[in-house]
């Protein structure tokens, strides 16, 4: 069964900078990746970025840079402009559309006890939704 993993990482040098890493574990070719925060895409979440392997990327503030890391993983850099750090308590979700498998989505957040520079373990927290 395909799985999606999500890691949220706080940058050690800039406490206002976060990076979300997502990856797809399974066969098939990735046709689209959607990253959202505050919940799954289309279920209360707010879209942060869309990455298409053949057409490019699109991102919305506070996303700073969305990019492919490998054929089946992406990263999204976030810039927190506020004095407080809302990202620390936020859920980030990544949805991978894969042909012919369908869509697979998982969510993750920064662990409350995380030290800067440490990331959540890449344990998939699957939302059981395969379109």
């Amino acid at each position: 069964t395909p799985e999606v993993w999500v890691q949220v990482q706080m940058e050690a040098t800039e406490l206002s900078s976060f990076t979300v890493h997502c990856g797809f574990l399974g066969p098939g070719s990735i046709s689209l990746v959607t990253v959202s925060w505050g919940g799954p895409d289309g279920a209360g979440g707010t879209k942060l970025a869309v990455l298409h392997p053949e057409l490019g990327t699109r991102q919305w503030a506070p996303a700073r840079q969305a990019r492919w890391e490998t054929q089946s993983s992406i990263s999204l850099a976030l810039e927190d402009s506020g004095a407080s750090s809302p990202f620390a308590n936020t859920t980030f979700c990544c949805k991978f559309a894969s042909f012919p498998e369908g869509s697979w989505e998982s969510c993750g957040s920064l662990p409350p006890s995380s030290d800067p520079g440490l990331s959540a373990p890449p344990t998939p927290v699957p939302i059981l939704r395969a379109d």
Epitope: P53, E54, G56, Q71
Partner: nanobody
Framework: EVQLVESGGGLVQPGGSLRLSCAAS????????MGWYRQAPGKDRELVAT???????KYVDSVKGRFTISRGDAKNSLSLQMNSLRAEDTAVYYC????????????WGQGTMVTVSS
Amino acid sequence: EVQLVESGGGLVQPGGSLRLSCAASETYFDLYVMGWYRQAPGKDRELVATITYTGSIKYVDSVKGRFTISRGDAKNSLSLQMNSLRAEDTAVYYCNADPSGLGRKVYWGQGTMVTVSS
């Protein structure tokens, strides 16, 4: 599909300047890597310069200090300012886009001819 359309080629004397432009049809997505390649008569196509979405730039050694690559505000337009042109710069110049940065799908323009001759 992404269409790339180049413009700005022409005939110029040695030591002169030209500015090439490239416009991408796809505007919803941002293209991660864009670049210029060239192919001289009887030679293989070679890299001239590339620029990523984040502004990382690479030039082939033979054009360093003479050519400048840049992207427009929309990130989907590209230009190449060519100064101090030499006869060996004569070639067809092609705009290139690699949306993912991984080479999964690469797009090419139709090319624009640059001739450096007195």
